[in-house]
């Protein structure tokens, strides 16, 4: 069963998942001037058993101008997008995927991938919203939306978030007991296809809304 819509749009906000439920698909998209290799995967799929989940398939891109280039494996940590704001002493190595049964972590970037990610979510997936830089949340803390099924139909719950243009506070404000408001809980675990974008967020992030897709350039 497909989700009828994308996650709700909130003006001046972006959304992201903490982790991805099994069954989630990520399109293998390449940046301009590149294309998927012939016989390459169309998508990555989060699969697993009761104790271990991981992304099946590898996304591989090759230059549109060359025919025989098939190099493109997931980049090594030192080649991956730098996590500039964390001042890590060494590259952060993800822990074993088994630590999140039923879920996959954010897939690492692949060489020449597109600047936006298109995910196909399953029912029960939760995404979290935050105001973009330059806007503050009237409802403090991360708001969430859940893809849920009710009476045989899928829908996304409405996140409780309003972003207002106040430059002096962060997009994730709040010293005094901020909150996040869940609305509703998923009632079944059938599939829900949703096209959306994913982001590699930096604190100094900028986001623009184009039709129903949020686009953020990788930093």
């Amino acid at each position: 069963e497909l989700c009828d819509d994308d996650p709700p749009e909130i003006p001046h906000a972006t959304f992201k998942a903490m982790a991805y439920k099994e069954g989630t698909m990520l399109n293998c998209e390449c940046k301009r001037g590149f294309r998927r290799i012939k016989s390459g995967s169309l998508y990555m799929l989060c699969t697993g058993n009761s104790s271990h989940s991981s992304w099946d398939n590898q996304c591989q891109c090759t230059s549109s101008a060359t025919r025989n280039t098939t190099k493109q494996v997931t980049p090594q940590p030192e080649e991956q997008k730098e996590r500039k704001t964390t001042e890590m002493q060494s590259p952060m190595q993800p822990v074993d995927q088994a630590s999140l049964p039923g879920h996959c972590r954010e897939p690492p970037p692949w060489e020449n991938e597109a600047t936006e990610r298109i995910y196909h979510f399953v029912v029960g997936q939760m995404v979290y919203y935050q105001c973009v830089q330059g806007y503050r949340a009237l409802h403090r803390g991360p708001a969430e939306s859940v893809c849920k099924m009710t009476h045989g139909k899928t829908r996304w719950t409405q996140p409780q978030l309003i972003c207002t243009g106040e430059m002096e506070t962060s997009q994730f404000p709040g010293e005094e007991k901020p909150q996040a408001s869940p609305e509703g809980r998923p009632e079944s675990e059938t599939s829900c296809l949703v096209t959306t974008t994913d982001f590699q967020i930096q604190t100094e992030m900028a986001a623009t809304m184009e039709t129903s897709i949020f686009t953020t350039e990788y930093q």
Partner: nanobody, 121 residues
Framework: QVQLVESGGGLVQPGGSLRLSCAAS????????VSWARLTPGKRLEWVSA???????YYADSMQGRFTISRDNAKNTVYLQMNSLKPEDTAVYYC???????????????WGQGTQVTVSS
């Protein structure tokens, strides 16, 4: 290599309390936000709480007023004090670090192995 080690879970009766700890290493702890999330028996992954590098705290509604997050930068440890526990709080609780180190929920990529909390009479 980043390491996150949770402890403090266990079996507790409804209305009881637990204090979870997350000991971190392998990165500059004081400049990073830390989140707690939980995986319910139905395999639902829920964000619980977060604390930013400046000490700002964030809570999900259902935990508001019952849970308190804090950090001790000298010990590279984050704590989650859980009071008035309910059966629906039963879950594996995970300590997590966002990939850019600052935004408490977005882009979490680094997880501990989790600690089981069971609330039952």
């Amino acid at each position: 290599q980043v390491q996150l080690v949770e402890s403090g879970g266990g079996l507790v009766q409804p209305g009881g309390s637990l204090r979870l700890s997350c000991a971190a290493s392998g990165f500059t702890f004081s400049s990073s936000a830390v989140s707690w999330a939980r995986l319910t028996p139905g395999k639902r992954l829920e964000w619980v709480s977060a604390i930013a590098s400046d000490g700002s705290t964030y809570y999900a509604d259902s935990m508001q007023g019952r849970f308190t997050i804090s950090r001790d930068n000298a010990k590279n440890t984050v704590y989650l004090q859980m009071n008035s526990l309910k059966p629906e709080d039963t879950a594996v609780y995970y300590c997590a670090i966002p990939r850019d180190g600052l935004v408490p929920v977005f882009g979490i990529d680094y997880w501990g192995q989790g600690t089981q909390v069971t609330v039952s009479s």
